[in-house]
C-alpha cells in the first residue's frame, strides 16, 4: 500500500497519484439510465447561474432544463454522466461549484431507484473507473464539535465511495484506536461508515479520525469529542406544559408534561379529589390521587390520556416530577362542556407551579 | 421484486429453541444489512437484532442478548435467527426486515412468523 | 439504550383532518429516525427516513421533520386509508429502538 502522511480532513496523495491535480473532490449523484435527476447549485447569492459539463457550456435541450439554481436532466443515460459546474456571476467575482453525475445501472439490484440522497450508490467495483476515495455525503459529516452529556451515545460518520471500494479505519488523537482503548469497547458498522461509543465517559474526549483508502488515494476527517458530565438537579419541565384542555361529555384528551432530568425520574400524575364532600383532610392537606405514574408497568408516564370524560372529571390535574435532588411540578385545568358545545382548545396557560412537599 | 419469506415459527416450551429462517429475493442480498423485529400480541414493535451484509457486525437488543444468534448465508440469500432459552415473554410475530443501505429504515419487510412460547 | 417517546398514544380525526405525531427521544439522536404505518395484521411500511425523506411510493401528504430530540410526523389532509398506528424509530445507537406507537382511528 502506498504511504501516507496525515494531514486533516484532506485528499492524501498518494507517492503516484492517480490524477494530475486534484483540488476537492466534487459530489457525486448517481442515477440509473431512464431516471430524472434533479441538482440544485449549491452557491449563495447567485445571481446569474452559467452551466458547463466536462468544460463544455451546458444550455436546455429537449432532456436538459435550466431553471435558476435548479439543472434537470430528464431520462438520463450513461453520456450524460461526467464533471459538471455551476458558475455565479457576481458583481465583483464569480465562484464555481464542481459536481459529478454518473448514470449507470450498476447500482446494487432491488435497490430504490428514486433515491435522492445519492449517498448509498456506488460505481460496481468491477467496473474500470478506478477511482480515489471520495466524501458521498458531505452534510453528514458537517458537525465536527460533539459535546455531548456523560452516559450518551456518540456516533461519528465518514460516508465514503471510491473504486475499489475503500477500506475505513478510525484514530483516536492521531493513533490507532483500538477495542481495548475504552470500556466497552466502540461499534464499527463498515456499510454506514459510522464508529458508534455508548455511554461515554470523560475519558472518551479527544479528537477521533476516520482515514478512507484504497490502493488510488485517502481522505480523512477529523471530529472533535467533548464529554459533558452531568451535573445534578431537580426535573425540569418544559413551560407551557400540562396545558389547560377543555372536551365535551364523553370525549377524549390527553395532558402531556415534558420531563427533563439527567438523574431517573419519577412521574406522578395527581388530581385534587373530593371526600365527604370536602376537598380537605382535617388536617388541612388537600385529598390526592394518583391516576398514573411511572413504573414497569406504565407505558410514556409523560402522558395522561382520559378517555370518555365525565363531569367528575373536570378540574386541576398535576405532573409532579421527583427525583433523588428534588421535584417539580405543574398543573393544567380540564372543563368538560355539556354534549351540545363544541369542544375548543383554551388558551394554553401555564399554571404556577405548586410545588407538592 | 423483493421479497422476504419467514418461517420457522411455530409453538415452543419455555427454555426451549427454534430456528427462524428469512428467504431472500429480488435483490443482492449480500449488500444489504437485515433485521429482525419482532410484535408481541396487541404490542408495538421492537427491534431484536441486525447483521452486516458481509456478516462482520451484529448486534442484538438487550432482551435478548446470550439468547438468540443472528446469521446469514449470502450463498443462499438466506437470513436466520437461532432462538434459544426461550420465554414466555418472547412470544411474538418475527419480521425480518430489509435495512436501506446507510439509513438504517426498514424499506422491505417479510409476512412475520409467529412464534409462541407456552408450556 | 436510548428511548424514543411517542405521544399521543392515539387519536381520533376525521378524513381531511390534519394530523400531527410526536417522537422524543431521550438524546441527541440527529436526523437518525424512520416513521412507519402499520395496519392490523400486516407488515410495517416505511414512510420515512432520516427524519424528513419520503419513502418511494408514498403519498406527499405525508411529512416528517425535526432533528436532536424532537420530531414530526404530519399527515396534511388525512384519508381513509390512513388509519393505522404509526411507529417511530431511532437508528442513531445500536440499537434500533422504537416508539410504542400512535394510533389514528375514526372519530
Known amino acids: 500500500r502506498p504511504s501516507f502522511s496525515l494531514v486533516e480532513d484532506t485528499t492524501l496523495e498518494p507517492e503516484e497519484p492517480p490524477t494530475k491535480y486534484q483540488i476537492s473532490q466534487p459530489e457525486v449523484y448517481v442515477a440509473a439510465p431512464g431516471e430524472s435527476l434533479e441538482v440544485r447549485c449549491l452557491l449563495k447569492d447567485a445571481a446569474v447561474i452559467s452551466w458547463t459539463k466536462d468544460g463544455v457550456h451546458l444550455g436546455p435541450n429537449n432532456r436538459t432544463v435550466l431553471i435558476g439554481e435548479y439543472l434537470q436532466i430528464k431520462g438520463a443515460t450513461p453520456r450524460d454522466s461526467g464533471l459538471y459546474a455551476c458558475t455565479a456571476s457576481r458583481t465583483v467575482d464569480s465562484e464555481t461549484w464542481y459536481f459529478m453525475v454518473n448514470v449507470t445501472d450498476a447500482i446494487s439490484s432491488g435497490d430504490d431507484e428514486d433515491d435522492t440522497d445519492g449517498a448509498e450508490d456506488f460505481v460496481s467495483e468491477n467496473s474500470n473507473n478506478k477511482r480515489a476515495p471520495y466524501w458521498t455525503n458531505t452534510e453528514k459529516m458537517e458537525k465536527r464539535l460533539h459535546a455531548v452529556p456523560a452516559a450518551n451515545t456518540v456516533k461519528f460518520r465518514c460516508p465514503a465511495g471510491g473504486n475499489p471500494m475503500p477500506t475505513m479505519r478510525w484514530l483516536k488523537n492521531g493513533k490507532e484506536f483500538k477495542q481495548e482503548h475504552r470500556i466497552g469497547g466502540y461499534k464499527v458498522r463498515n456499510q454506514h461508515w459510522s464508529l458508534i461509543m455508548e455511554s461515554v465517559v470523560p475519558s472518551d474526549k479527544g479528537n477521533y479520525t476516520c482515514v478512507v483508502e484504497n490502493e488510488y488515494g485517502s481522505i480523512n476527517h477529523t471530529y472533535h469529542l467533548d464529554v459533558v458530565e452531568r451535573s445534578p438537579h431537580r426535573p425540569i419541565l418544559q413551560a407551557g406544559l400540562p396545558a389547560n384542555a377543555s372536551t365535551v361529555v364523553g370525549g377524549d384528551v390527553e395532558f402531556v408534561c415534558k420531563v427533563y432530568s439527567d438523574a431517573q425520574p419519577h412521574i406522578q400524575w395527581i388530581k385534587h379529589v373530593e371526600k365527604n364532600g370536602s376537598k380537605y383532610g382535617p388536617d388541612g392537606l388537600p385529598y390526592l390521587k394518583v391516576l398514573k405514574h411511572s413504573g414497569i408497568n406504565s407505558s410514556n408516564a409523560e402522558v395522561l390520556a382520559l378517555f370518555n370524560v365525565t363531569e367528575a372529571d373536570a378540574g386541576e390535574y398535576i405532573c409532579k416530577v421527583s427525583n433523588y435532588i428534588g421535584q417539580a411540578n405543574q398543573s393544567a385545568w380540564l372543563t368538560v362542556l355539556p354534549k351540545q358545545q363544541a369542544p375548543g382548545r383554551e388558551k394554553e396557560i401555564t399554571a404556577s407551579p405548586d410545588y407538592l412537599e | 421484486e423483493v421479497q422476504l419469506l419467514e418461517s420457522g415459527g411455530g409453538l415452543v416450551q419455555p427454555g426451549g429453541s427454534l430456528r427462524l429462517s428469512c428467504a431472500a429475493s429480488g435483490f443482492t442480498f449480500s449488500d444489504y444489512a437485515m433485521s429482525w423485529v419482532r410484535q408481541a400480541p396487541g404490542k408495538g414493535l421492537e427491534w431484536v437484532s441486525v447483521?452486516?451484509?458481509?456478516?462482520?457486525?451484529?448486534h442484538y437488543a438487550d432482551s435478548v442478548r446470550g439468547r438468540f444468534t443472528i446469521s446469514r448465508d449470502n450463498s443462499k440469500n438466506t437470513l436466520y435467527l437461532q432462538m434459544n432459552s426461550l420465554r414466555a415473554e418472547d412470544t411474538a410475530v418475527y419480521y425480518c426486515?430489509?435495512?436501506?443501505?446507510?439509513?438504517?429504515?426498514?424499506?422491505?419487510w417479510g409476512q412475520g412468523t409467529l412464534v409462541t412460547v407456552s408450556s | 439504550d436510548i428511548q424514543m417517546t411517542q405521544s399521543p398514544s392515539s387519536l381520533s380525526a376525521s378524513v381531511g383532518d390534519r394530523v400531527t405525531i410526536t417522537c422524543r427521544a431521550s438524546q441527541d439522536i440527529s436526523s437518525d429516525l424512520n416513521w412507519y404505518q402499520q395496519k392490523p395484521g400486516k407488515a410495517p411500511k416505511l414512510l420515512i427516513y432520516?427524519?424528513?425523506n419520503l419513502q418511494s411510493g408514498v403519498p406527499s401528504r405525508f411529512s416528517g421533520s425535526g432533528s436532536g430530540t424532537d420530531f414530526t410526523l404530519t399527515i396534511s389532509s388525512l384519508q381513509p386509508e390512513d388509519f393505522a398506528t404509526y411507529y417511530c424509530q431511532q437508528h442513531y445507537s445500536p440499537s434500533h429502538t422504537f416508539g410504542q406507537g400512535t394510533k389514528v382511528e375514526i372519530k
Open positions: 426486515a430489509r435495512e436501506r443501505t446507510y439509513s438504517s429504515a426498514f424499506d422491505y
Open positions: 432520516d427524519a424528513s
Open positions: 447483521i452486516e451484509g458481509d456478516a462482520s457486525y451484529t
